[in-house]
């Protein structure tokens, strides 16, 4: 009976299966295979075609999101015949039950918060769970500390980011006794979600004609060197009329972070504060504490 089924619907003979944990699509190896390819098509008709694994009976998708639903497809030619099979991977569960407004940010160099909102059609007993997989080791991190709202998980706090890599896959699953809950998934770059601390060790030293501002680059989660930073200095004269523009100075990161500017004695009271950003993204940190220099009677 099974062999009849195969001839009537030859696609079934490939037995295509997808493991969402490993993002691995696999099928039954066919003897004398001359060609094989796998790909997925998403709801926007974008096609993703990964490299085949060495055994040619599986392929791994590296950077894909599945929550909108995708269709996997496998084409195999053998010396005798050709096979094709589609595998629908829908996001089963009631529409509108998945977590929404999902976002994460890294702060203080080694902490991360992720937050989300309950889906609009989710039942009262819904519970959400966050899993994170890194791109390199495919290791799964389960949320260690949930942030709750009336007993429902609506966020997660991580204080150990050692398992993350530069790009990570975030999955929010849901459960309910009443109905099926859809999942939400997202790929996030750590460099895009990190909020830097302001620069540290800000000092100002003045002589008769100039003032020299020095600072240290902030400690970050990402491995960044000095040229990867951009700084902004706000040099502000105290007790000026409201509406007077501050002097904002852009300074590229350097091995010795410093800015020397002319300021002759007697000098009025000034303050300086500094903020930092990744030079590629310019996602500014908050300002450092203002440092005052000069005198009231300057």
């Amino acid at each position: 009976e099974k062999s009849d089924l195969r001839t009537v619907a030859p696609a079934s003979s490939l037995n295509v299966r997808f493991d969402s944990r490993t993002m691995n699509l696999s099928w039954d190896c066919q003897e004398n295979t001359t060609f094989s390819k796998c790909f997925l098509t998403d709801k926007k008709n974008r096609v993703v075609e990964p490299r085949l694994s060495n055994n040619e009976c599986s392929c791994t998708f590296r950077e894909i999101c599945l929550h909108e639903g995708v269709t996997f497809e496998v084409h195999v030619n053998t010396s005798q015949r050709g096979f094709q099979q589609k595998l629908l991977y829908p996001n089963s569960g009631r529409e509108g039950t998945a977590a929404q407004n999902f976002s994460c940010f890294i702060y203080n160099a080694d902490l991360m918060n992720c937050t989300w909102a309950r889906g609009p059609t989710a039942p009262r007993d819904v519970q959400y769970f966050l899993y994170i997989r890194n791109s390199k080791r495919r290791r799964e991190i389960r949320c260690p500390y949930y942030i709750q709202d009336s007993g429902t998980h609506v966020g997660c706090h991580l204080d150990n980011l050692s398992g993350l890599t530069s790009r990570n896959y975030f999955l929010v699953n849901g459960t309910s006794r009443e109905i099926g809950i859809q999942f939400f998934d997202s790929l996030l770059d750590t460099k895009k979600i990190e909020r830097f601390n302001p620069p540290s060790n800000v000092t100002v030293r003045c002589n008769t004609t100039h003032c020299l501002v020095r600072w240290k680059q902030p400690r970050t989660y990402q491995k960044l060197s000095y040229l990867d930073f951009q700084y902004q200095l706000d040099v502000h004269r105290k007790n000026t009329q409201p509406g007077t523009e501050n002097l904002l100075i852009n300074v590229s990161g350097d091995l010795e972070n410093r800015y020397n500017f002319p300021s002759s004695e007697p000098r009025a009271k000034h303050s300086v504060k500094i903020r930092a950003a990744d030079v590629r993204i310019l996602n500014w940190s908050s300002w450092s504490e203002a440092i005052e220099f000069g005198s009231d009677d300057g």
């Epitope: 060197s225 040229l227 590629r280």
Partner: antibody
Framework: QVQLVQSGAEVKKPGASVKVSCKIS????????IHWVRQTPTKGFEWMGG????????VYAQRFQGRVTMTEDTSIDTAYLTLSSLRSDDTAVYYC?????????????WGKGTMVTVSS | QAVLTQPSSVSGAPGQRVTISCTGS?????????VSWYQQLPGTAPKLLIY???KRPSGVPDRFSASKSGTSASLAITGLQADDEADYYC???????????FGGGTKLTVL
């Protein structure tokens, strides 16, 4: 001002080892990522290896693996390159450099280079 | 054979504009990894001219600019001066195998 001062030129026989030093002044070595690059007239620049903060260890280019060792003595702000089993095609100028950006690995400060000649 | 391909030489008269190309592949420049450019005057160590594809370290004149598109990058020098005569190298990271790669170098002659 940061400076990288390298040891003097060396002449070695095939099969021998050479150790080149790179002394950092004006900054603490422990805060830097030092890499080694060599230059030959035939092959141009070849990256040999250096400290990768992502891996938190010194990483080596595949073609030098097993023959090269890079060490650091942070107490005297000095990095060392040792290349063993020298061959005539290891004749090159060896540079130490500081990584100024980890995005694409840009080398900002360079030593003046150490000429190593391998000849029988 | 360098993985990043550059023309062996270019030339231009003082005041002119010249460009130097650097062609890579999908495992380096197109991956996309950032490109850096270096100037090496005869008998000296290289000097960083460009990093992050188009950023200049402090002290590098704005006559030097660079861009990147797909698997290629290019360095442009405007208002050519006699002391620009040097060798120019592009450099990027490569994931196959994971190594830092340099171009073969381009000799710039100021006529």
């Amino acid at each position: 001002q940061v400076q990288l001062v390298q040891s003097g030129a060396e002449v070695k026989k095939p099969g021998a080892s050479v150790k080149v030093s790179c002394k950092i002044s004006g900054h603490s070595l422990s805060e830097l990522s030092i890499h080694w690059v060599r230059q030959t007239p035939t092959k141009g620049f070849e990256w040999m290896g250096g400290f990768d903060p992502e891996e938190n260890e010194i990483v080596y280019a595949q073609r030098f693996q097993g023959r090269v060792t890079m060490t650091e003595d942070t107490s005297i702000d000095t990095a060392y390159l040792t290349l063993s089993s020298l061959r005539s095609d290891d004749t090159a100028v060896y540079y130490c450099s500081i990584v100024g950006s980890f995005s694409g690995w840009a080398f900002d400060y360079w030593g003046k280079g150490t000429m190593v000649t391998v000849s029988s | 054979q360098a993985v990043l391909t550059q023309p062996s030489s270019v030339s231009g008269a003082p005041g002119q504009r010249v460009t130097i190309s650097c062609t890579g592949s999908g495992s380096n420049i197109g991956a996309p990894y950032d490109v850096s450019w270096y100037q090496q005057l005869p008998g000296t160590a290289p000097k960083l001219l460009i990093y992050h594809n188009n950023k200049r370290p402090s002290g590098v004149p704005d006559r030097f600019s660079a861009s990147k598109s797909g698997t290629s990058a290019s360095l442009a020098i405007t208002g050519l001066q006699a002391d620009d005569e040097a060798d120019y190298y592009c450099q990027s990271y490569d994931s196959e195998p994971t190594e830092i790669r340099f171009g073969g170098g381009t000799k710039l002659t100021v006529l």
